[in-house]
Protein backbone atom coordinates (compact mmCIF):
# COMPACT_ATOMS: atom_id res chain seq x y z
CA UNK A 1 0.00 0.00 0.00
CA UNK A 2 1.12 3.51 -0.75
CA UNK A 3 1.87 5.39 1.95
CA UNK A 4 3.54 8.64 0.34
CA UNK A 5 2.51 10.48 -2.81
CA UNK A 6 5.05 11.30 -5.61
CA UNK A 7 6.60 14.80 -4.32
CA UNK A 8 5.75 17.81 -6.37
CA UNK A 9 7.79 20.31 -8.03
CA UNK A 10 9.00 24.01 -6.48
CA UNK A 11 10.46 26.81 -8.47
CA UNK A 12 10.56 30.38 -8.14
CA UNK A 13 9.58 32.73 -10.90
CA UNK A 14 10.40 35.19 -12.05
CA UNK A 15 13.69 34.00 -10.86
CA UNK A 16 15.69 31.40 -7.76
CA UNK A 17 17.92 34.75 -7.42
CA UNK A 18 15.30 37.86 -6.14
CA UNK A 19 16.76 41.61 -6.19
CA UNK A 20 16.04 43.22 -2.28
CA UNK A 21 12.32 44.57 -1.92
CA UNK A 22 11.58 42.83 -5.40
CA UNK A 23 8.46 40.38 -5.39
CA UNK A 24 8.85 36.74 -5.63
CA UNK A 25 6.39 33.89 -6.49
CA UNK A 26 7.01 30.14 -5.36
CA UNK A 27 5.40 28.12 -7.33
CA UNK A 28 4.56 24.32 -6.23
CA UNK A 29 2.93 21.69 -8.61
CA UNK A 30 1.53 18.78 -7.19
CA UNK A 31 -1.93 16.92 -7.77
CA UNK A 32 -5.05 17.60 -9.32
CA UNK A 33 -7.03 16.57 -6.19
CA UNK A 34 -4.48 17.99 -3.24
CA UNK A 35 -6.68 19.31 -0.43
CA UNK A 36 -3.97 21.30 0.87
CA UNK A 37 -0.48 22.52 0.12
CA UNK A 38 2.23 23.75 2.75
CA UNK A 39 5.23 25.60 2.23
CA UNK A 40 8.13 25.28 4.36
CA UNK A 41 11.01 27.65 5.34
CA UNK A 42 14.36 26.47 6.79
CA UNK A 43 12.51 23.45 7.94
CA UNK A 44 9.65 25.08 9.47
CA UNK A 45 5.79 25.44 8.36
CA UNK A 46 5.53 28.84 6.37
CA UNK A 47 2.40 29.29 4.32
CA UNK A 48 -0.63 26.96 3.56
CA UNK A 49 -2.94 27.02 0.53
CA UNK A 50 -6.47 24.86 0.49
CA UNK A 51 -7.44 25.67 -3.32
CA UNK A 52 -10.79 25.47 -4.18
CA UNK A 53 -12.13 23.40 -6.12
CA UNK A 54 -9.31 21.11 -5.37
CA UNK A 55 -9.81 18.92 -8.47
CA UNK A 56 -9.62 21.53 -10.89
CA UNK A 57 -6.07 22.82 -9.22
CA UNK A 58 -2.92 21.65 -9.38
CA UNK A 59 -0.45 24.06 -8.76
CA UNK A 60 -0.26 26.95 -5.93
CA UNK A 61 1.92 30.15 -5.75
CA UNK A 62 3.21 31.74 -2.67
CA UNK A 63 3.83 35.21 -3.11
CA UNK A 64 7.04 36.87 -1.16
CA UNK A 65 6.14 40.80 -1.98
CA UNK A 66 9.44 42.31 -0.61
CA UNK A 67 12.68 39.67 -0.28
CA UNK A 68 14.98 40.36 2.10
CA UNK A 69 17.86 38.76 3.69
CA UNK A 70 15.30 36.89 5.97
CA UNK A 71 13.29 35.40 3.40
CA UNK A 72 16.31 34.01 1.86
CA UNK A 73 17.31 30.41 2.31
CA UNK A 74 15.84 27.10 1.51
CA UNK A 75 11.99 26.06 0.73
CA UNK A 76 10.28 23.14 0.10
CA UNK A 77 7.07 21.80 -0.42
CA UNK A 78 4.42 18.91 0.12
CA UNK A 79 0.50 18.35 -0.81
CA UNK A 80 -2.29 16.61 0.80
CA UNK A 81 -4.95 14.25 -0.84
CA UNK A 82 -7.44 13.13 1.72
CA UNK A 83 -4.85 12.43 4.44
CA UNK A 84 -1.92 10.87 2.25
CA UNK A 85 1.02 13.16 2.36
CA UNK A 86 3.32 13.57 -0.51
CA UNK A 87 7.03 13.15 -0.50
CA UNK A 88 8.30 16.96 0.37
CA UNK A 89 9.83 18.48 -2.52
CA UNK A 90 13.74 18.99 -3.69
CA UNK A 91 15.17 22.14 -1.83
CA UNK A 92 14.61 25.49 -3.89
CA UNK A 93 17.54 27.65 -2.56
CA UNK A 94 16.08 31.46 -2.92
CA UNK A 95 18.45 33.95 -2.85
CA UNK A 96 18.65 37.79 -2.31
CA UNK A 97 21.07 39.98 -4.65
CA UNK A 98 21.72 43.76 -4.46
CA UNK A 99 23.38 43.48 -1.00
CA UNK A 100 25.28 46.27 -0.22
CA UNK A 101 28.38 46.11 -3.00
CA UNK A 102 29.35 45.45 -6.68
CA UNK A 103 32.23 43.82 -7.36
CA UNK A 104 34.77 43.90 -10.32
CA UNK A 105 35.11 41.01 -12.88
CA UNK A 106 37.91 40.87 -15.02
CA UNK A 107 39.41 38.36 -17.53
CA UNK A 108 42.70 37.00 -18.07
CA UNK A 109 44.74 37.07 -20.88
CA UNK A 110 41.42 39.43 -21.67
CA UNK A 111 37.90 38.83 -23.59
CA UNK A 112 39.13 38.13 -26.56
CA UNK A 113 40.91 34.67 -27.20
CA UNK A 114 42.15 31.65 -29.15
CA UNK A 115 40.29 27.77 -28.90
CA UNK A 116 42.70 26.12 -26.76
CA UNK A 117 43.88 28.91 -24.65
CA UNK A 118 43.42 28.98 -20.85
CA UNK A 119 41.27 31.49 -19.57
CA UNK A 120 40.96 32.63 -16.21
CA UNK A 121 38.25 35.04 -14.23
CA UNK A 122 38.81 37.25 -11.18
CA UNK A 123 36.24 38.66 -9.11
CA UNK A 124 37.08 40.97 -6.80
CA UNK A 125 35.10 42.87 -3.69
CA UNK A 126 36.66 45.08 -1.20
CA UNK A 127 33.90 44.17 1.46
CA UNK A 128 34.00 41.28 4.01
CA UNK A 129 33.13 38.25 2.06
CA UNK A 130 35.20 35.23 1.44
CA UNK A 131 32.89 33.42 -1.07
CA UNK A 132 32.21 34.73 -4.94
CA UNK A 133 30.36 33.23 -7.76
CA UNK A 134 30.65 33.32 -11.16
CA UNK A 135 27.79 33.23 -13.76
CA UNK A 136 26.87 33.10 -17.53
CA UNK A 137 24.55 34.23 -19.22
CA UNK A 138 21.88 31.76 -20.62
CA UNK A 139 19.55 28.70 -19.99
CA UNK A 140 21.69 26.86 -17.36
CA UNK A 141 22.36 29.89 -14.72
CA UNK A 142 25.36 27.31 -13.91
CA UNK A 143 26.70 28.89 -10.88
CA UNK A 144 30.60 28.43 -9.94
CA UNK A 145 31.99 28.76 -6.91
CA UNK A 146 35.40 30.86 -5.80
CA UNK A 147 36.97 31.62 -2.25
CA UNK A 148 39.45 35.05 -1.50
CA UNK A 149 39.55 37.27 0.96
CA UNK A 150 38.78 39.77 -1.36
CA UNK A 151 39.34 37.85 -4.86
CA UNK A 152 38.77 34.49 -6.33
CA UNK A 153 39.70 33.33 -9.03
CA UNK A 154 37.96 31.10 -11.66
CA UNK A 155 40.04 29.19 -14.28
CA UNK A 156 38.06 27.71 -16.94
CA UNK A 157 40.94 25.74 -18.49
CA UNK A 158 41.74 25.47 -22.10
CA UNK A 159 38.61 27.45 -23.58
CA UNK A 160 36.22 26.06 -26.39
CA UNK A 161 33.53 27.64 -28.41
CA UNK A 162 31.00 26.35 -25.69
CA UNK A 163 32.54 29.43 -22.94
CA UNK A 164 31.73 31.89 -25.17
CA UNK A 165 29.19 34.17 -23.46
CA UNK A 166 28.56 36.31 -20.79
CA UNK A 167 29.52 36.33 -17.75
CA UNK A 168 28.98 38.28 -14.62
CA UNK A 169 30.03 37.75 -10.71
CA UNK A 170 28.61 38.12 -7.19
CA UNK A 171 30.15 38.53 -3.82
CA UNK A 172 28.30 36.06 -1.04
CA UNK A 173 27.54 37.06 1.94
CA UNK A 174 26.61 33.77 3.00
CA UNK A 175 24.58 31.10 0.76
CA UNK A 176 21.61 32.85 0.29
CA UNK A 177 22.75 36.96 0.18
CA UNK A 178 24.60 37.93 -2.67
CA UNK A 179 26.17 41.12 -3.58
CA UNK A 180 25.10 43.55 -6.64
CA UNK A 181 26.01 41.35 -9.91
CA UNK A 182 29.25 42.71 -11.65
CA UNK A 183 29.60 44.79 -14.90
CA UNK A 184 29.40 41.74 -17.54
CA UNK A 185 32.24 40.54 -19.49
CA UNK A 186 31.62 39.11 -22.78
CA UNK A 187 34.34 36.29 -23.99
CA UNK A 188 35.10 35.83 -27.18
CA UNK A 189 36.59 32.37 -28.19
CA UNK A 190 37.83 32.31 -32.29
CA UNK A 191 39.74 30.22 -34.06
CA UNK A 192 37.74 26.93 -33.83
CA UNK A 193 38.24 25.01 -36.93
CA UNK A 194 34.61 23.27 -36.89
CA UNK A 195 32.67 26.31 -35.81
CA UNK A 196 33.61 30.00 -35.29
CA UNK A 197 29.80 31.25 -35.65
CA UNK A 198 28.23 32.16 -32.85
CA UNK A 199 25.68 29.34 -31.76
CA UNK A 200 22.36 30.44 -30.11
CA UNK A 201 21.20 29.16 -26.76
CA UNK A 202 18.74 26.15 -27.32
CA UNK A 203 15.47 28.37 -27.82
CA UNK A 204 13.43 25.85 -26.46
CA UNK A 205 14.77 26.83 -22.91
CA UNK A 206 14.38 30.36 -21.22
CA UNK A 207 16.81 32.38 -20.57
CA UNK A 208 16.99 32.29 -16.87
CA UNK A 209 19.35 35.12 -16.72
CA UNK A 210 17.57 37.84 -19.17
CA UNK A 211 14.24 37.02 -16.62
CA UNK A 212 16.74 37.67 -13.74
CA UNK A 213 17.88 40.90 -15.35
CA UNK A 214 14.30 42.13 -16.18
CA UNK A 215 13.42 41.34 -12.72
CA UNK A 216 16.49 44.15 -11.53
CA UNK A 217 15.38 46.65 -14.34
CA UNK A 218 11.55 46.43 -13.34
CA UNK A 219 10.40 44.55 -10.42
CA UNK A 220 7.79 42.81 -12.61
CA UNK A 221 6.51 39.21 -12.52
CA UNK A 222 6.67 37.33 -15.78
CA UNK A 223 4.80 34.36 -15.59
CA UNK A 224 7.82 31.70 -16.46
CA UNK A 225 7.52 28.55 -15.46
CA UNK A 226 11.22 28.59 -14.22
CA UNK A 227 12.27 25.16 -12.73
CA UNK A 228 14.21 26.16 -9.69
CA UNK A 229 18.24 25.30 -10.24
CA UNK A 230 18.78 21.63 -8.58
CA UNK A 231 17.59 19.28 -10.69
CA UNK A 232 13.77 18.02 -10.11
CA UNK A 233 14.25 13.85 -10.56
CA UNK B 1 0.54 51.57 4.23
CA UNK B 2 -1.50 49.52 6.54
CA UNK B 3 -1.70 50.58 10.27
CA UNK B 4 -2.83 47.71 12.11
CA UNK B 5 -3.98 48.61 15.93
CA UNK B 6 -5.54 45.69 18.48
CA UNK B 7 -7.94 45.78 21.20
CA UNK B 8 -10.14 43.76 23.95
CA UNK B 9 -7.11 42.63 25.68
CA UNK B 10 -7.44 42.73 29.67
CA UNK B 11 -7.66 40.31 32.45
CA UNK B 12 -9.78 37.03 32.49
CA UNK B 13 -9.86 34.42 34.81
CA UNK B 14 -8.94 30.62 33.52
CA UNK B 15 -11.68 28.93 31.67
CA UNK B 16 -13.19 31.98 30.69
CA UNK B 17 -12.82 34.27 27.12
CA UNK B 18 -11.49 36.99 25.40
CA UNK B 19 -12.72 38.89 22.18
CA UNK B 20 -9.13 40.33 20.37
CA UNK B 21 -10.09 43.46 17.88
CA UNK B 22 -7.51 44.51 14.87
CA UNK B 23 -8.58 47.46 13.59
CA UNK B 24 -6.77 47.93 10.06
CA UNK B 25 -6.25 51.50 8.26
CA UNK B 26 -5.24 51.30 5.01
CA UNK B 27 -7.19 50.53 1.46
CA UNK B 28 -5.63 47.26 0.80
CA UNK B 29 -5.95 45.74 4.05
CA UNK B 30 -9.28 43.53 2.58
CA UNK B 31 -6.86 41.85 0.16
CA UNK B 32 -4.43 41.00 2.33
CA UNK B 33 -3.91 37.47 4.37
CA UNK B 34 -3.35 38.06 7.77
CA UNK B 35 -2.71 36.50 11.80
CA UNK B 36 -2.61 36.87 15.34
CA UNK B 37 0.73 35.94 16.67
CA UNK B 38 1.67 36.48 20.16
CA UNK B 39 4.45 36.71 23.09
CA UNK B 40 4.89 34.86 26.58
CA UNK B 41 6.71 36.91 29.33
CA UNK B 42 10.14 35.49 28.36
CA UNK B 43 9.19 33.30 25.86
CA UNK B 44 9.71 33.51 22.06
CA UNK B 45 7.14 35.05 19.24
CA UNK B 46 4.35 32.38 18.25
CA UNK B 47 2.24 31.77 15.51
CA UNK B 48 -1.69 31.69 17.21
CA UNK B 49 -4.09 31.61 13.88
CA UNK B 50 -4.01 32.75 10.73
CA UNK B 51 -6.99 33.76 8.01
CA UNK B 52 -6.93 34.18 4.29
CA UNK B 53 -7.60 37.64 2.59
CA UNK B 54 -11.32 35.89 1.94
CA UNK B 55 -11.46 34.69 5.23
CA UNK B 56 -12.42 30.95 3.26
CA UNK B 57 -9.32 29.66 5.11
CA UNK B 58 -7.99 29.91 8.19
CA UNK B 59 -5.12 27.84 10.05
CA UNK B 60 -4.37 27.35 13.58
CA UNK B 61 -1.72 26.63 16.11
CA UNK B 62 -1.96 23.01 17.53
CA UNK B 63 -2.53 24.39 21.17
CA UNK B 64 -4.96 26.79 19.99
CA UNK B 65 -7.41 24.57 17.96
CA UNK B 66 -10.74 24.24 18.90
CA UNK B 67 -10.56 26.63 21.67
CA UNK B 68 -9.70 29.79 19.69
CA UNK B 69 -11.39 31.17 16.15
CA UNK B 70 -9.99 34.20 13.85
CA UNK B 71 -12.62 35.79 11.66
CA UNK B 72 -12.49 39.35 9.77
CA UNK B 73 -15.04 41.36 8.43
CA UNK B 74 -13.69 43.66 5.28
CA UNK B 75 -16.30 45.81 4.98
CA UNK B 76 -15.48 46.81 8.20
CA UNK B 77 -11.30 46.67 8.14
CA UNK B 78 -11.33 44.66 10.67
CA UNK B 79 -10.11 40.70 12.06
CA UNK B 80 -10.81 38.80 15.17
CA UNK B 81 -9.65 36.28 17.20
CA UNK B 82 -12.21 34.62 19.97
CA UNK B 83 -10.19 33.05 22.86
CA UNK B 84 -12.28 30.38 24.93
CA UNK B 85 -11.11 28.20 27.34
CA UNK B 86 -8.41 30.42 28.40
CA UNK B 87 -5.30 28.77 30.09
CA UNK B 88 -2.62 30.60 32.51
CA UNK B 89 -0.59 29.89 29.30
CA UNK B 90 -1.94 31.82 27.38
CA UNK B 91 -0.93 34.77 29.18
CA UNK B 92 1.10 37.15 26.56
CA UNK B 93 1.04 40.05 24.12
CA UNK B 94 -1.19 39.29 21.11
CA UNK B 95 -0.35 40.97 18.20
CA UNK B 96 -2.15 40.94 14.67
CA UNK B 97 -0.06 41.36 11.52
CA UNK B 98 -0.46 41.75 7.96
CA UNK B 99 1.60 40.36 5.23
CA UNK B 100 2.98 42.62 2.26
CA UNK B 101 0.56 44.74 -0.10
CA UNK B 102 2.19 44.69 -3.38
CA UNK B 103 0.60 41.13 -4.68
CA UNK B 104 -2.32 39.18 -5.86
CA UNK B 105 -2.82 36.71 -2.73
CA UNK B 106 -4.61 33.40 -3.20
CA UNK B 107 -7.86 33.84 -1.78
CA UNK B 108 -7.10 30.75 0.04
CA UNK B 109 -3.53 31.11 1.23
CA UNK B 110 -2.56 31.10 4.74
CA UNK B 111 1.18 32.58 6.17
CA UNK B 112 2.02 30.77 9.35
CA UNK B 113 5.63 32.26 9.62
CA UNK B 114 6.34 35.75 11.28
CA UNK B 115 8.92 36.69 8.84
CA UNK B 116 6.63 36.89 6.15
CA UNK B 117 4.12 39.66 7.67
CA UNK B 118 5.37 43.40 6.66
CA UNK B 119 2.82 45.23 9.05
CA UNK B 120 2.19 44.57 12.62
CA UNK B 121 -0.13 46.42 15.30
CA UNK B 122 1.48 47.53 19.04
CA UNK B 123 0.41 44.40 20.59
CA UNK B 124 -2.91 43.90 23.33
CA UNK B 125 -1.97 42.53 26.80
CA UNK B 126 -3.89 39.04 28.08
CA UNK B 127 -3.48 38.21 31.04
CA UNK B 128 -5.24 34.84 32.24
CA UNK B 129 -5.38 34.70 36.55
CA UNK B 130 -5.90 31.82 38.62
Known amino acids: QQQTLPKPFIWAEPHFMVPKEKQVTICCQGNYGAVEYQLHFEGSLFAVDRPKPPERINKVKFYIPDMNSRMAGQYSCIYRVGELWSEPSNLLDLVVTEMYDTPTLSVHPGPEVISGEKVTFYCRLDTATSMFLLLKEGRSSHVQRGYGKVQAEFPLGPVTTAHRGTYRCFGSYNNHAWSFPSEPVKLLVTGDIENTSLAPEDPTFPDTWGTYLLTTETGLQKDHALWDHTAQN | QVQLVESGGGLVQAGGSLRLLCAAS????????MAWFRQGPGKDREFVAA????????YYADSMKGRFTISRDNAKNTAYLQMNSLRLEDTAVYYC???????????????????????WGQGTQVTVSS
Open chain 2, 97 to 119: AAVGDSAPYSATIVYTDARAYAY
Open chain 2, 26 to 33: GRTFSRLP
Open chain 2, 51 to 58: ISWSGGST
